[in-house]
């Protein structure tokens, strides 16, 4: 076990809607620390939502991703640890506005951190169940997420945290599917990705294609919000307190105040740099931005968070 | 407009193999998935699993693992479908269907191919 | 896996007749349905998805409600061209699961 910093390194200020179980790879809870208890989902896409544990469906999805982390490891699913090199890069984004995406250090970790890991690589992120990951939080994991038609028809009502790079350590995030690929669902602005490798475990029966390019943000979009369309609004507000502010999608009531505070834990330096993670920002229907991304390549995994600088929020508002 | 055109009709014998393409045309072909499903003659559907092109992973119904194979080209954006080993109770009409990222349903569809399996 | 149970299999009713069709999944599915229909010879045609919600180009005739474990397609005022099979796919997770479909033929 891994007994990380206690202090809260994710804080939901909104909980998302409901999003199917086949699209989720993993979950962990928030430290107890947080002081509102969620549920962080992560999806195929590699993007995380908070939710709400008192809700039917997320004990329902919890559930199923236990089984599915359980049966994998039963199937003789093994850990692999990946360590990643993050780059700082500029990638347009949906939404008008320049969001600064920096990973800032809030605690030593043990040396068994949160790391990158290519998005196209799932196949390859520990399986098994850990009771603690590195910051204190638990988790399981599982299945993985589908794409979706149009944009302008929405994406889940819900608060995404922020875009995650696919993450493995060894005994902590872990995913029962072979992959867990797909177009950037919300938040739809990504640095390029890096060739896929096939996942060994699906053999024969896996498919084989070039490597995996751009999405485009306009595509691959419906809604989970049971009949309702996003409405996205174009504010974004900074909050000034607390670890970073990272950008939350409400996907229905998406609007102000949908934050999510992100603390980082510094990678541990073993291994070598494998390919750069993903980093998105917000999603919106419209318009193009660069997303800049600064961090210290060797030092920072995982938790890549979208926060608007000051001339942004006041652009938008 | 968006449209998936499929291969056509093939007779098989008894453990040999059968490939199917599905070619994608009037959206981004890497923005999607792709799930193909079958139904046998008089039949109700049946999910056989779905691709993603961006990167070609796949994922499949644990009754088709194993001799199922998902494919696909970016270049042509086309997607396949290999069944091996087919048995007879493999005849049914094939067909790739295009799935959004926010769910697995099936928002627009080819227009099937016919596998006769017999000896 | 869940299992999808659809009823009446078959249903004989006249243009202009209200017609329902239900859905049963041995688990709850959260609202995580899809509705098809699909006529002789053809491939199914994306009608409702997350339950009620109409695709594109579906007329307002169609609707869908239920949660939980039982939903419903309703045809308010049937048409000619309405006559067809119907199938419901749950995608709440995997494997999906359809209905074993419902005909609506001709009274």
């Known amino acids: 076990q891994h007994h990380g910093v206690t202090k809260c390194n994710i804080t939901c200020s909104k909980m998302t809607s409901k999003i199917p179980v086949a699209l989720l790879i993993h979950y962990q809870q928030n430290q107890a620390s947080c002081g509102k208890r969620a549920i962080i989902l992560e999806t195929r896409q590699h993007r995380l939502f908070c939710a709400d544990p008192k809700e039917q469906w997320v004990k329902d999805a919890m559930q199923h991703l236990d089984r599915q982390a359980a049966a994998l490891t039963r199937n003789g699913g093994t850990f692999e640890k990946q360590i990643g090199e993050v780059k700082p890069r500029t990638t347009p984004a949906a939404g008008g506005m320049d969001e600064s995406v920096v990973l800032e250090p809030e605690a030593t970790g043990e040396s068994s951190s949160l790391e990158p890991t290519p998005s196209s690589q799932e196949a390859q992120r520990a399986l098994g169940t850990s009771p603690e990951l590195p910051t204190g939080v638990t988790g399981s994991s599982g299945t993985r997420l589908p794409p979706t038609p149009k944009a302008q028809d929405g994406g889940p009502v819900g608060t995404e945290l922020f875009r995650v790079p696919p993450v493995s350590t060894a005994a902590t995030w872990q995913s029962s599917a072979p992959h867990q690929p797909g177009p950037s669902l919300w938040a739809e602005a990504k640095t390029s990705e890096a060739p896929s490798t096939q996942d060994p475990s699906t053999q024969a029966s896996t498919a084989s294609s070039p490597a995996p390019e751009e999405n485009a943000p306009s595509e691959g979009q419906r809604v989970w919000g049971q009949g309702q369309s996003p409405r996205p609004e174009n504010s974004l507000e900074r909050e000034e307190m607390g670890p970073v502010p990272a950008h939350t999608d409400a996907f229905q009531d998406w609007g102000p105040g949908s934050m999510a505070h992100v603390s980082v834990v510094p990678v541990s330096s073993e291994g070598t740099p494998s390919r750069e993670p993903v980093a998105s920002g917000s999603w919106t229907p419209k318009a193009e931005e660069p997303i800049h991304a600064t961090m210290d390549p060797q030092r920072l995994g995982v938790l890549i968070t979208p926060v608007p600088d000051a001339q942004a929020a006041t652009r938008r508002q | 407009q968006v449209q998936l055109v499929q291969s056509g009709a093939e007779v098989k014998k008894p453990g040999a193999s059968v490939k199917v393409s599905c070619k994608a045309s009037g959206y981004t072909f890497t923005n999607y998935y792709i799930h193909w499903v079958r139904q046998a003659p008089g039949q109700g559907l049946e999910w056989i699993g779905w691709?993603?092109?961006?990167?070609?992973?796949?994922k499949f119904n644990e009754r088709f693992k194993g001799r199922t194979t998902l494919t696909a080209d970016k270049s042509t954006s086309t997607a396949y479908m290999e069944l091996s080993s087919l048995r007879s109770e493999d005849t049914a009409v094939y067909f790739c269907?295009?799935?959004?990222?926010?769910?697995?349903?099936?928002?627009?569809w080819g227009q099937g191919t016919t596998v006769t399996v017999s000896s | 896996d869940i299992q999808m149970t659809q009823s009446p299999s078959s249903l004989s009713a006249s243009v202009g007749d209200r017609v329902t069709i239900t859905c049963r999944a041995s688990?709850?599915?959260?609202?995580?349905l899809a509705w098809y229909q699909q006529k002789p010879g053809k491939a199914p045609k994306f009608l409702v998805y997350n339950e009620k919600t109409l695709a594109d180009g579906v007329p307002s005739r169609f609707s869908g409600s239920g949660s939980g474990t039982q939903y419903t397609l309703t045809i308010s005022s049937l048409q000619p061209e309405d006559f067809a099979t119907y199938f419901c796919q749950q995608f709440w997770s995997t494997p999906y699961t359809f209905g074993g479909g419902t005909k609506v033929e001709i009274k």
């Open positions: 691709i993603y092109p961006g990167d070609g992973s796949p």
């Open positions: 688990g709850n599915i959260h609202n995580f």
């Open positions: 269907a295009r799935g959004p990222t926010d769910g697995d349903y099936f928002d627009y």
